[in-house]
Structure formats: structure tokens, C-alpha cells
Amino acid sequence: TLNSVLNSNAIKNLPPPLGGAAGHPGSAVSAAPGILYPGGNKYQTIDNYQPYPCAEDEECGTDEYCASPTRGGDAGVQICLACRKRRKRCMRHAMCCPGNYCKNGICVSSDQNHFRGEIEETITESFGNDHSTLDGYSRRTTLSSKMYHTKGQEGSVCLRSSDCASGLCCARHFWSKICKPVLKEGQVCTKHRRKGSHGLEIFQRCYCGEGLSCRIQKDHHQASNSSRLHTCQRH
């Protein structure tokens, strides 16, 4: 079951509480009524698990990727899992920890020694899950070694948003991923209504910037569900 799988990996796949190591004994939640606050639980033990649901790798931390915790397990259940270290098996780049990338199903180092000039590598990009590409074929993309050492500008090839400069995110463009601008107020955004629908986009948009959310444009409320236009709007 999902519980047993997650319990078996509880500490491995969880961050330590703020301000302490995992399992640090500690204090209760603040007594102030009706207040949310950072790390309110920071010294609580984590013998239990705290799965963080996701639909895309970008929703997880830089040391994580988004996937189903069990093969053949709960269909559609995806959570953030700890990244794979060097020489571990992988199916896509985001599964490998920072400083590594997925090559021939194995996480390998992406340091200078492995990138003399430009190299050609296979990006097996997964669209919506761990096990498939859009049409079942790998796409070959030329990656520059520079992208692993400087933050990518708009249009630069990337593996994850942390590869991109501030104000940019890593989003799909055809069968590679490039740095695109985070959406600003009033810009059209994509609202994923169906589970896994983000996997069908070959021209993926970034998410809305801080303080904005993707909502139906006011004058489109009467439109049919399928034609509703969503834009980034202030709360």
C-alpha cells in the first residue's frame, strides 16, 4: 500500500524539520489561535510520513522529483521523492540529484570533466509520468556544458527551473525544455483541470509569479468550460 511504501522511506524521503535533524524531539504547535507561522511544528518528530503531492517535478524541491511511490501502485498518485544519486537508475534528468543527469538509464555526473565543449545526449523526457514519452521515441538534444555552471537566460536549454535565471522557469518547448519567463499579471496561464493534462503540452507555460494565481478571466465567466481563458491575477 501507499502507506507502507512511504513509511518504509519515511525519513529518507522527508526533509528534516526546520531547525533540527529528522526525528528531533520537541515542542507543540503554537497556542496562538488561528495563526499559521513558519516551522510551527519544527521540532516535531517525523515517525509518520508527510507526502507532498505533485503533478510535475517543478513542484518538488531541487533534491527531489515527482513520481508515483510504487510501481503499479495507486494510479495517479504522485508525490515528491528523494532524488537519485550518481550511478543509480533513472528514467529522466529530474530524477537525478543536482550535478547529475540521466544518461542511458543511469545518473551520471554533469561536472566539467563530463562536458568538454558540447556533447550530444539523449533526453528521454517523460510526459505526465515516469514511463512514457509523447510518442515513445527519445529526442536528441545538444546541451552546452555552460548550462550546468551559469544560470540560463531566456531560451537556454534547461533540465530544471534551478538551471534558469531569476524570473524564469524551465518549461517544455517541443521535446526539449528551455528557460521561459514566469508569468506576470494579466498574462494567459494554463489551468490543469484533468490529472496528467500537463503532460500533453509541448509548449508549456511557466507558472504565475509570486502573489498571482491562475484564474478565469472576469469577462469569460459565461463562456463554456472548454473555452474559458485563464490569466494570472492578484489575490
Epitope: 507532498y52 513542484e59 518538488c60 524541491g61 531541487t62 527531489e64 498518485v77 484533468r194 500537463h198 507558472y207
Partner: nanobody, 125 residues
Framework: EVQLVKSGGGLVQAGGSLRLSCAAS????????MGWFRQAPGKEREFVAA????????VYADSVKGRFTISRDNAENTVYLQMNSLKPEDTAVYYC??????????????????WGQGTQVTVSS
């Protein structure tokens, strides 16, 4: 300071339903996963359910699967927990939690960094 307005807790008979809501203000939660946890007397706090920022991905504890439904309304900055077919063992203090936004906010691990004050749910037999 982030304010959290919670409602929906209370006393209910076994087999009954309750809906918890957790509305946040003062910080943008639309980009973060949100979850519900609970703590019964003398027990550790346990995970109940969580939902990602867009609502496209949800995860449930085995003990509540098929009975509880988590949902969210980003326009209202609110997350809901619909609890049906309640059992006496569901009796606990229920907590709402918000995530940190993961790598998009510079974090190495996606985690629940913001926790709310609990609301009591009591299921009588």
C-alpha cells in the same frame, strides 16, 4: 503574520459527515501544496490527505481513502476536507498545513512549513 480561519470541526455520530475548511490570508498559498494532518490523544500527529497547488494531484492515508476528499479553491485561498462515513477512530485534532513551494521558491525539499492551529473532530459511536 499569516492568519488562518478554520471551520467545520465538531461532534458527529459514527457514519456522519463533516467538512473542514482552512482559509489562509497574508501569504500566497496558491502555489503551494496543502494538507491535513490529525493527532489523536496520546498518539503522534499523522498524515490524512494533501493536494498539490493546482488541485491535479491528491494523496490520502490508507485509513481515510474512499471516505475523505481533499479539495482547494485558489481564488479563495482555501483548502477543504470533506469527511464522510466517519468512524470513532477518526476522533482527533485536525491540523491544516501549507507547503513551501519547492524548487520554485528555492527549496531543496518540498515540505509543510506552515501549520495551523488544530480543530477538534469528535466521532461518537
Amino acid at each position: 503574520e499569516v492568519q488562518l480561519v478554520k471551520s467545520g470541526g465538531g461532534l458527529v455520530q459514527a457514519g456522519g459527515s463533516l467538512r473542514l475548511s482552512c482559509a489562509a490570508s497574508g501569504r500566497t498559498f496558491s502555489s503551494y501544496a496543502m494538507g491535513w494532518f490529525r493527532q489523536a490523544p496520546g498518539k503522534e500527529r499523522e498524515f490524512v490527505a494533501a493536494i498539490n497547488w493546482s488541485g491535479s494531484s491528491t494523496v490520502y492515508a490508507d485509513s481515510v481513502k474512499g471516505r475523505f476528499t481533499i479539495s482547494r479553491d485558489n481564488a479563495e485561498n482555501t483548502v477543504y476536507l470533506q469527511m464522510n462515513s466517519l468512524k470513532p477512530e477518526d476522533t482527533a485534532v485536525y491540523y491544516c498545513a501549507a507547503g513551501n513551494g519547492g524548487r520554485n521558491y528555492g527549496h531543496s525539499r518540498a515540505r509543510y512549513d506552515y501549520w495551523g492551529q488544530g480543530t477538534q473532530v469528535t466521532v461518537s459511536s
